[in-house]
């Protein structure tokens, strides 16, 4: 009988055999059968002067029971035997169909052999302790999308076929998931010229963040700011009022970059500038301001006495000139008002430009001379509407000099004494509050002639 049957080489479809024999025989009979149930027995003969052969056209990944008999004059010897499995082939054509931040989709070529499943393994090469993700797929499948991966990580993907609980050799490819962009972008504290951009840092390890912004409808005009990986907010300035802006954030690492995360916002209306009081009367205040840059519908003026009281509101059209002027009427005399002027466009309103301005004290009413004598004049008047501190009563002397008398605010009459007979006197009565003075009430009167 043959001795020392050796399997010298195995491939996916062939098995090389060699054996020893001390004596010359007519031929050898090679019999091979798959070990699985229902396997078909096959055989072929080898000339007696050969001690090796190749079994061909085997099925990949199948275990065979092989026997070699020596035949001499039509008699079969006891066989030598061996068990050997053909190799499973490695898959081919593994390609990346899509690579995203947390998913990778792969595809590969079909295999025209019998096997049970594909096995695909994803291994994070940056985090060895993370473990592998293994997925089994039924045979007709030739693509797979793995989700739940970490952004910006290097993954090794290996593809095998499995037959009879045996995993074939793997076809390996390496890829890196895309960097994720900063998330949850918010635009806060938007004014007419500034905005604060905030975001959550990406999950991927990155070198830095690129923030780009510009007017939405002007794609070419963009400003780019390079930020460190630790930053999570940035304040943009020098923006145009009432303009829609687009801001985008990109994560960067080396030559990798994430998809942009985008947000749009519209700057506020700019407030009127250089608001000033032009003039005032006892019941009106005239205001003027420089118009803002934004195209607006009108200006809204809100005003109220600073000491408290109802507030009023009036809308005035924007002037075609560089400034707009308006007069608030029906105001209380001697009253300081807090005034705010804001720009209005549809449902938007700018921050107000503010100013405090006071109406003048109103003039004491109905100043008259009720009685004349040789050396005195009796004066009467009615109290002004404004709250005030005191009166100043001035009268001229025949010499051209003026004498003033300070009177308490509850006074409504006063006798000028020590005058000269038969002289004309000019009398001026003014209400005062702090440094503010009303326009004077005036009266002319003459003392009686001496007899």
């Amino acid at each position: 009988p043959p001795k020392d049957l050796v399997v010298t080489e195995v491939t996916e479809e062939t098995v090389n055999l060699a054996w020893d024999n001390e004596m010359r025989v007519t031929e050898y009979l090679v019999v091979y059968t798959p070990t699985h149930e229902g396997g078909l027995e096959m055989q072929f003969r080898v000339p007696g002067d050969q001690t090796s052969t190749i079994i061909q056209e085997l099925e990949p990944g199948v275990e065979y029971f092989i026997r070699v008999f020596a035949i001499l004059e039509n008699k079969k010897s006891i066989p030598v035997s061996a068990r050997v499995a053909t190799y499973l082939p490695a898959p081919e054509g593994l390609k990346f169909k899509s690579i995203k931040e947390t998913s990778v989709e792969v595809e590969w070529d079909p295999l025209d052999i019998a096997f049970e499943t594909w096995e695909i393994i994803f291994r994070n090469m940056n985090k060895e302790d993370e473990g592998e993700i293994t997925k089994s797929l039924r045979r007709p499948e030739t693509s797979y999308r793995q989700t739940g991966l970490a952004p910006g990580q290097e993954y090794e993907i290996s593809l095998h076929i499995v037959k009879n609980n045996t995993r074939g050799p793997g076809l390996k490819r390496v890829t890196t998931t895309r960097l994720d962009a900063p998330s949850q972008i918010e635009v806060k504290d938007v004014t007419d010229t500034t905005a604060l951009i905030t975001w959550f840092k990406p999950l991927a390890e990155i070198d830095g963040i690129e923030l780009t912004y510009g007017i939405k409808d002007v794609p070419g005009d963009r400003t780019t700011i390079d930020l460190t990986e630790d930053e999570n907010q940035y304040s943009i300035g020098n923006l145009k009022p009432d303009t829609e802006y687009e801001v985008s954030l990109i994560s960067r690492r080396g030559d990798m970059s994430s998809n942009p995360a985008k947000e749009t916002f519209t700057t506020g209306l700019d407030a009127p500038r250089n608001l000033r009081r032009v003039s005032q009367t006892d019941n009106s205040i005239t205001l003027e301001w420089r118009n803002g840059k934004a195209a607006i519908d009108s200006y809204r003026i809100k005003y109220a006495p600073i000491s408290g009281g109802d507030h009023a509101e009036v809308d005035v059209p924007k002037s075609q000139q560089a400034t707009t002027k308006t007069t608030l009427t029906g105001l209380r005399p001697g009253t300081e008002y807090g005034i705010g002027v804001s720009a209005v466009k549809e449902d938007k309103e700018s921050n107000p430009a503010t100013i405090n301005a006071a109406t003048e004290l109103d003039t004491p009413k109905d100043l008259q001379v009720s009685e004349t004598a040789e050396t005195s004049l009796t004066l009467l008047w009615k109290t002004p509407l404004a709250k005030f501190d005191r009166y100043r009563l001035n009268y001229s002397l025949p010499t051209g000099q003026w004498v003033g008398v300070q009177l308490p605010r509850n006074t409504t009459s006063y006798v000028l004494r020590g005058l000269e007979p038969g002289q004309e006197y000019n009398v001026l009565l003014t209400a005062e509050k702090g440094r503010h003075k009303s326009k004077p009430a005036r009266v002319k009167a003459s003392t009686e002639q001496a007899p």
């Epitope: 051209g400 000099q401 003026w402 004498v403 003033g404 440094r435 003075k437």
Partner: nanobody
Framework: QVQLVETGGGLAQAGGSLRLSCAAS????????MGWFRQAPGKEREFVAA????????YYDYTVQGRFTISKDNAKNTVNLQMNSLKPEDTAVYYC????????FGDGYEMDYWGDGTQVTVSS
């Protein structure tokens, strides 16, 4: 800097007279108005009288008009307050004050310079 020094204060009988003077030194007060305020114990400071730089225009509180006369001597940079027919309610510390305009005299908030004061006491 301007120093204002008041003199002439003291004790007087009701119906009597006193003459206060205020001398300004340190710089010329050309164009300034000068005047007097007073403060009685426990009361607010109040205006008494003032005179324009030219001396042509005067201003008095109604409580003193006809009794007090204000005058000034520009050559000496002084202002005087002649107080006649004194009453016990005239008892106070009298302060000299200087401002750019006669109009500023009234509430006393806008004075440029103040003296340290001189006591006037009127007994009944």
């Amino acid at each position: 800097q301007v120093q204002l020094v008041e003199t002439g204060g003291g004790l007087a009988q009701a119906g009597g007279s006193l003459r206060l003077s205020c001398a300004a030194s340190g710089r010329t007060l050309s164009g300034y108005a000068m005047g007097w305020f007073r403060q009685a114990p426990g009361k607010e400071r109040e205006f008494v009288a003032a005179i324009s730089w030219s001396g042509r225009n005067t201003y008095y509180d109604y409580t003193v008009q006809g009794r007090f006369t204000i005058s000034k001597d520009n050559a000496k940079n002084t202002v005087n307050l002649q107080m006649n027919s004194l009453k016990p309610e005239d008892t106070a510390v009298y302060y000299c004050a200087v401002s750019r305009s006669l109009d500023e005299f009234g509430d006393g908030y806008e004075m440029d310079y103040w003296g340290d004061g001189t006591q006037v006491t009127v007994s009944s």
